[in-house]
């Protein structure tokens, strides 16, 4: 029977409350991470003047942060679903070491830094289920990651602040590009 207007629907609603589709879940997971990044960026920008700094290039030389390029097939021109998906997963795996670096970089947002890291791991799992060509995904070498982490942590305070800012900015850009691409799939 129809639900009387204004009353909460019980039996009528139940069949419609299906779980989120894989695409809906991935979309929401990315936006969840982006929300966390915006909170972390707020703390970074409030704490230092890195967000207005013009000296980013100095620190960027130390970093090899994943970026989307034309060849990755994620842009509207030359879009390629499988190539793009491999790039997104590979990029996220490469970002993991940088997210680990962020873990001790926040005072008031420590839990949020952890949530971003954990949510990213979950996102990678969702995307790996979606990918057909898992063999094409290269996993970063743990030894290389460990030495990179040591190197980043040994930087002076200014460089560490700049590195934090650059990681957050790059990760945000990478996720935004990924979100646009995934919405086309």
């Amino acid at each position: 029977a129809p639900v009387p207007p204004g009353e909460d629907s019980k039996d009528v609603a139940a069949p419609h409350r299906q779980p989120l589709t894989s695409s809906e879940r991935i979309d929401k997971q990315i936006r969840y991470i982006l929300d966390g990044i915006s909170a972390l960026r707020k703390e970074t920008c409030n704490k230092s003047n890195m967000c207005e700094s013009s000296k980013e290039a100095l620190a960027e030389n130390n970093l090899n942060l994943p970026k989307m390029a034309e060849k990755d097939g994620c842009f509207q021109s030359g879009f390629n679903e499988e190539t793009c998906l491999v790039k997104i997963i590979t990029g996220l795996l490469e970002f993991e070491v940088y997210l680990e670096y962020l873990q001790n970089r926040f005072e008031s947002s420590e839990e949020q830094a952890r949530a971003v890291q954990m949510s990213t791991k979950v996102l990678i799992q969702f995307l790996q289920k979606k990918a057909k060509n898992l063999d094409a995904i290269t996993t970063p070498d743990p030894t290389t990651n460990a030495s990179l982490l040591t190197k980043l942590q040994a930087q002076n305070q200014w460089l560490q602040d700049m590195t934090t800012h650059l990681i957050l900015r790059s990760f945000k850009e990478f996720l935004q590009s990924s979100l646009r691409a995934l919405r086309q799939m």
């Epitope: 989120l20 969840y32 929300d35 949020q112 949510s119 979950v122």
Partner: nanobody, 116 residues
Framework: EVQLVESGGGVVQPGGSLRLSCAAS????????MGWYRQAPGKQRELVAD???????EYADSVKGRFTISRDNAKNTVYLQMNSLRPEDTALYYC??????????WGQGTLVTVSS
């Protein structure tokens, strides 16, 4: 046990307003993304609006500028203020919660009817 309890649905004339509420229990509300979905008879479910722990929001194009989602972490409640309602907004509206591990939960739904 997770519970999402919606209220505020009803019959309203075109151009009118309604405010939906969803009270959550059994989840760590402050770390959950909260959203409203709707489903009209014979149509696909669609995301109306969602709001994340630090306040980022997203709206369906069809409701932008008319609907506003907000949350009160102290009351474990999410709201959907719906203004300038149209007949095409008639649907069952569901509250939805989503946590960073990818777990999600649904309310039972509340009916919104826009009719003259």
């Amino acid at each position: 046990e997770v519970q999402l309890v919606e209220s505020g649905g009803g019959v309203v004339q075109p151009g009118g307003s309604l405010r939906l509420s969803c009270a959550a229990s059994g989840i760590i509300f402050s770390i959950n993304a909260m959203g409203w979905y709707r489903q009209a008879p014979g149509k696909q479910r669609e995301l109306v609006a969602d709001i994340f722990p630090f306040g980022s929001t997203e709206y369906a194009d069809s409701v932008k500028g008319r609907f506003t989602i907000s949350r009160d972490n102290a009351k474990n409640t999410v709201y959907l203020q719906m203004n300038s309602l149209r007949p095409e907004d008639t649907a069952l509206y569901y509250c939805h919660s989503y946590d960073p591990r990818g777990d999600d939960y649904w309310g039972q739904g509340t009916l919104v009817t826009v009719s003259s």
